[in-house]
Amino acid sequence: LSEEADDTDSELGSMKPLHTFCAMKADDGPCKAMIRSYFFNMYTHQCEEFIYGGCEGNENRFDTLEECKKTCIPGYEKTAVKAASGAERPDFCFLEEDPGLCRGYMKRYLYNNQTKQCERFVYGGCLGNRNNFETLDECKKICENPVHSPSPVNEVQMSDYVTDGNTVTDRSTVNNIVVPQSPKVPRRRDYRGRPWCLQPADSGLCKASERRFYYNSATGKCHRFNYTGCGGNNNNFTTRRRCLRSCKTGLIKNKSKGVVK
């Protein structure tokens, strides 16, 4: 059996954050937007993703993983330089691929100690180990030695979720719900709200059946759909009220455009 090193590696035990706010808990705030942000997790001594609501919260919130690491991880920039110069890599770079307990099919990258390169793998969405990076770039910076690797090909950044075959973006039906494709659909300039409110309902890639709501820009209303539990997009709200609060405000009420209020 492949036994993984613990997430609580001993080398990390004595680390102290650079700033007091790095010790604060992730705070999504009272608002209901869904903004991908990062915070420093005192328990794992890593910067991790969380969903920020868009207002209030605290200082332990960063727009990028890199910014979080630079701000809160002692010696991070030195470590990155070390890795780039072919010196020591963090121990977790040598952990074997671990897809984790769940099956959510997320595209991630890991450092392969056999090939000495960062490679794509499919992460299940929960647990796993720390040899797991959201971007190829981040994996290369931390674990790969660029001196020995070929020039990176500019890779198109796919969505976070791996799908089987081609993804249909403009769906006319999702979970048997007809998404109206009518002339009443507001053009982008008629909608000043959050861009994900214009996305079609996306049931995702797992097998659960969870009641969610999506904003239908054609009707200006929030409709129910079944979410499978992972994947999908940000036009996905746990209640109709949250959906309306998040998306309805961006609609410009212009009768001549035929947009339903």
Epitope: L1, S2, A26, M34, N41, L101, L127, K207, N236
Partner: antibody, heavy 123, light 112 residues
Amino acid sequence: EVQLQQSGPGLVKPSQTLSLTCAISGDSVSSDSAAWSWIRQSPSRGLEWLGIIYYRSKWYNRYAVSVKSRITINPDTSKNQFSLQLNSVTPEDTAVYYCARWHSDKHWGFDDWGQGTLVTVSS
Amino acid sequence: DIVMTQSPLSLPVTPGEPASISCRSSQSLLFRFGINYLNWYLQKPGQSPQLLIYKGSNRASGVPDRFSGSGSGTDFTLKISRVEAEDVGVYYCQQYTSYPLTFGQGTKVEIK
């Protein structure tokens, strides 16, 4: 319907090895949509997760740090079961031991449990 | 380890009345898209635990709709809209954001 049937001795002497087996029906130990765990329960510790194994093209395991040096969880694909071995037991290991299935596809939780085995560590 | 703290530890209830149990985690269990890595279990007297709620707010198969889970981040609530006699037992929350998987200490629900 998935069923987990536990077997093994209810009394173990201190310093010896606790061995329990969990026989699976209605699923496969090498299914890539499940993981198999041991959890114990005692009045002093409550529910305590001990470890888990799962198959995703190869076998993986994870153990709780509190028992890591003493625990082994192994699959037996021929008998469709998995086992727990806990070495060098002390009276603090006295507990009800449960095997459980982690549903990796839908629930992302322990959705099936064995009947529990009370193991007493005493000389 | 992520510490899960439940309150109250004991909850006397009247059949037909609502009941509410709180669970607080020492770090955020929010993943994304409103998914929280938190489950609720019920252990009826003399039985093994059973899964009630997964991912914070989704009822497991066969669980009556009087049970509902809510909350996000570090604060979660399990509600029973109208308690029935068969709902007695110990309720546990459990996180799976990081290893080791950890459970709350349990809330014992009993009929007054």
